[in-house]
């Protein structure tokens, strides 16, 4: 499908000297930051983010790579080199550890530098290093974290946790001797190392002791709680603070996030990961839009403005199985909550990022026709005389043999939501990818955000932007509309 | 293998209702709109009604606006056009078309359908 318009030169020419004006027009905020909000799209690597343009600009009726996401609003962009100390290709965990720690680790390690051993308890002290949302609640500020998988994850822990293995969500995860040489549980950290004001995502089936039903799920035994302690965390936590509010589905969340009273708020929304948004029960679990509102509603409360973590964390799981159906569909709710975000705060005094932690081996090819589905088949057979999508896997367990060839592909399949795409080296799961990944920048500091960088970088421009250690000698005029 | 079965079709008084089924095989609504176009005797041929699931939308031609609606049986794959009021007018052949798009955008334009149905044959009587 061709539009008319864009046949005729001046249809660019004219693009262009918009672009060029707004351009021309761009000033740099110099004032520091009140607010802080970094979105991270897990796995969401460059083609995610331009497959994810192509899907939500469908769902609005458009072309589709025409139609810009709310990201790509973002005036400032740069790369960030996602590598870990000790792996090319990074996980969630060494890689949040830059992000929010301004320090590079090793791979799933959380909140700890290099120095620390994987799954080696006693290499965890010392080696502590602090976010910034740690350093902004010691500045006063309100903080929260916001996402899809559970609370526990590595992408969020990296904002509160010091671990030496991710998988540790709660003690059950653990084994003996790490106990009892002092380690841990993410679950225990979330609660005891900082005061949170915002904890919103999944993960109820760590917070409570072994056997107790789940209040969803009370019959699933698989969905019980799992923590060998007998603690109950959330009632921990909610003794804590005379207005901490917890709440599992989404009428709970919506009255929490509207009451005056409310000062702390924890949303649990499944006992592990929040379900897919394809598969999600709007009645009874927000989206990830809904899920950030309520955050900024609670955390913009705080004249000393506020630090907010929000991840679309299973862009990741849907890569990983194959599915890019489930990713790309993630990626356009994350999309959404970044758009209801910048609705919701002011670009003269948030700083607003959005990156990836690493990307994906998930490539977007084969010459289709402008308009078409990003779900639909390449035009033409392959050197097999077979079809093939468009999107497809380096390695993964989209690979599959029929009768020691590749299956033929029908378009019946391909725009199936449970299809996997077809990879080109077997594996139970489909790997992350080395490249570098986005960063997108708006607000006071934003342009600081340019060229290739460290990802641990990330964390520096917060900081800085925010005066928090150790840049509290920032330098920089108070934030629009403050007095100090 | 793409195909389209349009049925439904039949011969009716004015002011009745009809409603037109379009079966549709070897592919998803996930892929790919449905357009139902028209042509009526010696006339040009008229697009009628787009419906997208990826979109969450329907359009309809002026002529029909507020009397014809579309609906998908996803399950079933199928789309069917609900015609009510029908008028004298509205006697023509009724074809229902794949678009290349899996959205509504230029769901009008004939060129931008990639698999079309045989037609199935509308006849209002005064």
């Known amino acids: 499908i061709i539009p008319v318009e864009e046949e005729n030169p001046d249809f660019w020419n004219r693009q262009a000297a918009e672009a060029l004006g707004a351009a021309k027009k761009l000033q740099p905020i110099q004032t520091a930051a009140k607010n802080l909000i970094i979105f991270l799209g897990d796995g969401m690597g460059v083609s995610t983010v331009t497959a994810a343009r192509i899907l939500k600009g469908q769902k609005e009726d458009k072309l589709g790579p025409e139609t810009p996401l709310a990201m790509d609003h973002f005036p400032y962009v740069a790369l960030s080199k996602t590598y870990s100390v000790d792996k090319h290709v990074p996980d969630s965990a060494a890689t949040a550890t830059a992000y929010l720690c301004g320090v590079k680790g090793n791979f799933q390690t959380i909140g700890l530098s290099a120095a620390a051993r994987y799954n080696q308890c006693n290499t965890t002290r010392g080696n502590e290093v602090v976010s910034v949302m740690n350093r902004a609640k010691k500045a006063g500020k309100s903080v929260g974290v916001v996402t899809t998988t559970r609370v526990q994850h590595a992408s969020p822990a990296g904002a509160y946790a010091h671990t030496v293995n991710r998988n540790w969500y709660s003690d059950a995860n653990m084994p003996g001797s790490a106990r009892r040489e002092g380690c841990k549980d993410i679950a225990t950290q979330l609660i005891s190392n900082m005061d949170i004001d915002v904890i919103l995502g999944g993960g109820r089936k760590y917070m409570f002791r072994m056997g107790a039903p789940d209040p969803e799920y009370p019959h699933d035994y698989s969905q019980d709680g799992t923590r060998m302690d007998g603690k109950n965390l959330v009632q921990e936590w909610l003794a804590k603070q005379q207005g901490a509010r917890y709440v599992w589905n989404r009428t709970e969340l919506m009255q929490a996030s509207l009451d005056p009273s409310v000062t702390h708020l924890m949303g649990l929304f499944e006992p592990g990961d929040m379900k897919y948004e394809i598969h999600r029960d709007p009645t009874l679990d927000p989206s990830l839009m809904e899920m950030t509102e309520a955050a900024l509603r609670l955390l913009s409360r705080n004249p000393r403005g506020f630090f907010l973590f929000v991840e679309g964390g299973r862009i990741d799981h849907g890569h990983h199985e194959s599915r890019a159906y489930r990713a790309l569909t993630e990626a356009v709710m994350f999309d959404d909550a970044i758009e209801r975000a910048g609705q919701l705060t002011s670009e003269e005094d948030t700083l607003t990022l959005v990156t990836a932690d690493h990307s994906h081996v998930f490539s977007f090819g084969a010459y289709p026709l402008r308009g078409s589905s990003i779900f639909g088949l390449a035009p033409g057979k392959a050197q097999d005389r077979k079809a093939y999508t468009a999107l497809l896997y380096g390695n993964g367990p989209g690979y599959v043999l029929k009768d020691g060839a590749r299956p033929d592909v029908t378009e019946s399949e391909s725009g199936s939501p449970e299809y996997r795409q077809q990879a080109a080296v077997p594996l139970d799961e489909e790997t992350h990818a080395g490249e570098d990944v986005a960063v997108f920048a708006r607000g006071p500091q934003a342009h600081l955000v340019h060229g290739v960088q460290e990802q641990s970088f990330i964390a520096h421009v917060m900081a800085f932007a925010a005066c928090l250690e150790p840049y509290t000698a920032c330098d920089l005029a108070p934030p629009a509309g403050t007095t100090d | 293998q793409v195909q389209l079965v349009e049925s439904g079709g039949g011969l009716v008084q004015a002011g009745a209702s009809l409603t037109l089924s379009c079966a549709a095989s070897?592919?998803?609504?996930?892929?790919?709109?449905i357009v139902w176009f028209r042509q009526a005797p010696g006339k040009e041929r008229e697009a009628v009604s787009c419906?997208?699931?990826?979109?969450?939308?329907?359009y309809y031609g002026d002529s029909v606006q507020g009397r014809f609606s579309s609906s998908t049986d996803n399950a079933k794959n199928t789309v069917s056009l609900q015609m009510n009021s029908l008028k004298p007018e509205d006697t023509a052949v009724y074809t229902c078309?794949?678009?290349?798009?899996?959205?509504?955008?230029?769901?009008?334009?004939?060129?931008?359908?990639?698999?079309w149905g045989e037609g199935t044959m509308v006849t209002v009587s005064s």
């Open positions: 078309a794949a678009s290349f798009a899996p959205n509504c955008y230029g769901w009008s334009v004939a060129a931008n359908m990639e698999y």
């Open positions: 070897g592919f998803t609504f996930n892929t790919r709109s």
């Open positions: 419906i997208s699931k990826v979109a969450g939308s329907t």
